[in-house]
């Protein structure tokens, strides 16, 4: 699954919430960022995440489409120079400071499983998705396509505005 371009094809600034409308928030603690899943008070401002969309070639041996086997990969950055990373060993989702080009652990395959929700599959560990576990984000193994609609891996994007990249 190689990224076909160095630049994102499009970018959005959005807030991220769970299928059950809990907000994904990011807090700086002891010089590192923690990720929380929580109910926000009525007027509390939602944290925003920059989603950068990249085109990726699907591995041709799995695709009957020849040149057409494209997927969308996303990176998620809640603050400058920090990106969500998949830690496949610990089954955790972490925020790390990175420089471009970003490591593969920062890329997630985008799935629209339902009309109003998305899922993020780890590029480095196919079949493993960002999900919610004990009020935190974690990596969750999904063993069959039927389980892709399981609510704990579904997220809603509330777009706040378009982000003009150059």
């Amino acid at each position: 699954m190689s990224i076909t371009g160095i630049s994102p094809i499009t970018e959005y600034l959005a807030s991220l919430s769970t299928y059950n409308d809990q907000s994904i928030t990011f807090a700086l603690e002891d010089e590192s960022y923690e990720i929380y899943v929580e109910d926000l008070k009525k007027d509390e401002k939602k944290d925003k995440v920059l989603l950068s969309y990249y085109e990726s070639q699907h591995p041709s041996n799995e695709s009957g489409d020849g040149v057409d086997g494209k997927m969308l990969m996303v990176t998620l950055s809640p603050t400058k120079d920090f990106w969500l990373h998949a830690n496949n060993k610990e089954h955790s989702v972490e925020l790390h400071k990175s420089e471009k080009p970003l490591p593969d652990q920062a890329f997630f395959v985008l799935h629209n499983m339902h009309s109003n929700s998305v899922s993020f599959e780890s590029k480095t560990d196919p079949g493993v998705f960002i999900g919610v576990k004990d009020n935190h984000l974690a990596l969750i193994k999904v063993d069959s396509s039927e389980n892709l609609s399981t609510e704990n891996i579904l997220f809603k994007l509330s777009e706040t505005h378009h982000h003009h990249h150059h």
Epitope: T10, M71, L72, H111, N112, M113, H114, S115
Partner: antibody, heavy 122, light 107 residues
Framework: QVNLLQSGATLVKPGASMKMSCKAS????????VSWVKQSHGKSLEWIGE????????NFNKEFKDKATLTVDKSTSTAYMELTRLTSEDSAVYYC???????????????WGQGTLVTVSS | IIVMTQSPKSMSISVGDRVTMNCKAS??????IAWYRQKPGQSPELLIY???NRYTGVPDRFTGGGYGTDFTLTINSVQAEDAAFYYC?????????FGGGTKVEIK
């Protein structure tokens, strides 16, 4: 190569229903969203709705919510659209389409069927 | 619903000419625009997506540009086969909407 083969032209009476088909080949049918688009004679294009064959999830243009029903048959890689309570306003060419990306819609129409002409007349 | 307005409605040009058509969105859509060509009696075909990305197999004489509310499709050195209707479409968000089209005729 990717191919979307639609059912043939139909003449239907006002008030009746009709179901058209779109048989997909050359790709993994369940992994791509399928959309339907209407083009009235000499007019522009209108998006009706989309369906994800893997889960059956769908998403509609409000204007067509009570007009169109989208279904799929995974065993034959075929998408269907049923139109109900037909009037002369529904006379049009209807296209099934598919996007460029696995798993994700983005509502971009990279592949098109040849279209099904529906004529509503008594 | 975001309205897409195309201009001009039609144009008549000679083979080899350079032509630019416009598409205006009623509100900011970022770069979420696609362009299609529909030749007489045929289904539409995707030319450009995300405002400026040429789709696979589309000749490089087609160029898309713009951001926000104003977009252009330019055809450098128009060919006889480019006689068609051209539609812009807002992508990504539901419901996607199409412009009314620009008809390109070859003199």
């Amino acid at each position: 190569q990717v191919n979307l083969l639609q059912s043939g032209a139909t003449l239907v009476k006002p008030g009746a229903s009709m179901k058209m088909s779109c048989k997909a080949s050359g790709y993994s049918f369940t992994d791509y969203w399928v959309s339907w688009v209407k083009q009235s004679h000499g007019k522009s294009l209108e998006w009706i709705g989309e369906i994800y064959p893997n889960s059956g999830a769908n998403n509609f243009n409000k204007e067509f919510k009570d007009k169109a029903t989208l279904t799929v048959d995974k065993s034959t890689s075929t998408a269907y659209m049923e139109l109900t309570r037909l009037t002369s306003e529904d006379s049009a060419v209807y296209y099934c389409t598919r996007g460029p990306y696995y798993y994700s819609s983005q509502i971009i129409f990279a592949y098109w069927g040849q279209g099904t002409l529906v004529t509503v007349s008594s | 619903i975001i309205v897409m307005t195309q201009s001009p409605k039609s144009m008549s040009i000679s083979v080899g000419d350079r032509v630019t058509m416009n598409c205006k969105a009623s509100q900011n859509v970022g770069n979420n625009i696609a362009w299609y060509r529909q030749k007489p009696g045929q289904s539409p075909e995707l030319l450009i997506y995300y405002a400026s990305n040429r789709y696979t197999g589309v000749p490089d004489r087609f160029t898309g540009g713009g951001y926000g509310t104003d977009f252009t499709l330019t055809i450098n050195s128009v060919q006889a086969e480019d006689a068609a209707f051209y539609y812009c479409q807002r992508i990504y968000n539901s419901p996607p909407t199409f412009g009314g089209g620009t008809k390109v005729e070859i003199k």
